[in-house]
């Protein structure tokens, strides 16, 4: 019946490996979008929400055209590790209001973990160095209030959504060059 969902298919074709990473990224993007929409419905919040501990968005005008695969994969893995930690933190620190979204946050964390494993595999297949984050992970303190955790959730999901869009676009663009 084929490999179980979590186990990567053995392949020496970088395009197939990249495809597999794109599929997981797109799938995670859809989940994130859905969860962000749920958040907006349950906890309406005007304007952009920022969290200083989140990574800055990798993509800016002009950068996509000059991307190289090692840079994209390394940056993506580092950024997604940060989002993984933030989702973990959110699940632990969330007040009662966010507990209603616990199953969805748990599923999101599991999918993030799976994508991180796939990226790690892809990097090792392509013999790329498994880069460590530029800076050690800063411990995340508890949110100041229930509203603080809601704002943090908006920021985390919004940032992850944009990061995953950057990833899909970057990876598919690179695939055309392989």
């Amino acid at each position: 019946p084929g490999p179980p969902a979590g186990s990567p298919r053995v392949s020496s074709d970088p395009r197939a490996d990249l495809d597999s990473a794109v599929l997981l990224t797109r799938s995670l993007l859809a989940d994130t979008r859905q969860l962000a929409a749920q958040m907006r419905d349950k906890f309406p919040a005007d304007g952009d929400h920022n969290l200083d501990s989140l990574p800055t968005l990798a993509m800016s005008a002009g950068t996509l055209g000059s991307l190289q695969l090692p840079g994209v994969l390394t940056r993506l893995r580092v950024d997604l590790m940060s989002y993984f930690r933030h989702v973990q933190w959110l699940r632990r620190a969330a007040g009662p209001s966010l507990k209603t979204l616990e199953p969805e946050l748990g599923a999101l964390q599991a999918r993030l973990e799976r994508l991180l494993r796939r990226l790690q595999l892809l990097m090792s297949r392509l013999a790329l160095p498994q880069a460590a984050p530029d800076q050690p992970a800063v411990p995340l303190g508890p949110p100041a209030s229930a509203w603080g955790s809601i704002r943090a959730a908006h920021a985390i999901l919004g940032g992850l959504h944009l990061t995953l869009d950057w990833a899909v676009r970057g990876l598919l663009l690179l695939k055309t060059r392989l």
Epitope: D19, L23, T25, R26, S27, L29, A30, R33, L57, M59, S60, A61, G62, T63, L64, G65, H161, L162, L164, D165, W166, V168, R169, L172, L173, K175, T176
Partner: antibody, heavy 119, light 111 residues
Framework: EVQLVQSGAEVKKPGASVKISCKAS????????MDWVKQAPGQRLEWIGD????????IYNQKFTGRATLTVDKSASTAYMELSSLRSEDTAVYYC????????????WGQGTTVTVSS | DIVLTQSPASLALSPGERATLSCRAS??????????IHWYQQKPGQAPRLLIY???NLESGVPARFSGSGSGTDFTLTISSLEEEDFATYYC?????????FGQGTKLEIK
């Protein structure tokens, strides 16, 4: 109501440039990518490229790389497409379309801008 | 680039009849449960309108007589019972890879 309103028809000489605008309303501009599609007479629809309004990061169909430039003005919820070194084959209707992040299907379209390239 | 071929090029039917439009891709546009094919309707002088996304999902506001099916390389748009306003040109589009490409269209005409 979600709407994309494009600038009016243009007539240009070969070698010139054209810049088309697309004003978005009724939704959060940065929640979707803005894509551009060409429809030349008797030809199939052709994807030119897209831009993420949040970051201003564009990607292009290789066929249009170097001639098409996509930009956004976030504060005005407006996207722009500039096409340079125009030739007769660029005579077409150009559409902006709202693109779902990461999936490239287009659920809202502008009314189209006709560009005629003629000497 | 992936090439999409639509058939027939034109189709003449009467209101109330069932329409079946086909779209074939030069390589698979499906992967692990997702099919990256979308369908649009276009009337003369108007912009295209999204009907179906990801092969079988009906876009909000589109009548239930429209449905999409298929996987791999072969996809179908079905209109169960044609209404006067359905006579138009229909395009399929893929987003499996970059660049997204469109089919050449099927023109649905009144018999």
């Amino acid at each position: 109501e979600v709407q994309l309103v494009q600038s009016g028809a243009e007539v240009k000489k070969p070698g010139a440039s054209v810049k088309i605008s697309c004003k978005a309303s009724g939704y959060t501009f940065t929640d979707y990518n803005m894509d551009w599609v060409k429809q030349a007479p008797g030809q199939r629809l052709e994807w030119i490229g897209d831009i993420n309004p949040h970051s201003g990061g564009p990607i292009y169909n290789q066929k249009f790389t170097g001639r098409a430039t996509l930009t956004v003005d976030k504060s005005a919820s407006t996207a722009y497409m500039e096409l340079s070194s125009l030739r007769s084959e660029d005579t077409a209707v150009y559409y902006c379309a709202r693109g779902e992040l990461g999936h490239w299907y287009f659920d809202v379209w502008g009314q189209g801008t006709t560009v005629t390239v003629s000497s | 680039d992936i090439v999409l071929t639509q058939s027939p090029a034109s189709l003449a039917l009467s209101p109330g009849e069932r329409a079946t439009l086909s779209c074939r891709a030069s390589k698979s546009v499906s992967t692990s449960g997702y099919s990256y094919i979308h369908w649009y309707q276009q009337k003369p002088g108007q912009a295209p309108r999204l009907l179906i996304y990801l092969a079988s999902n009906l876009e909000s506001g589109v009548p239930a007589r429209f449905s999409g099916s298929g996987s791999g390389t072969d996809f179908t748009l079905t209109i169960s019972s044609l209404e006067e306003e359905d006579f138009a040109t229909y395009y399929c589009q893929h987003s499996r890879d970059l660049p997204p490409t469109f089919g050449q269209g099927t023109k649905l005409e009144i018999k």
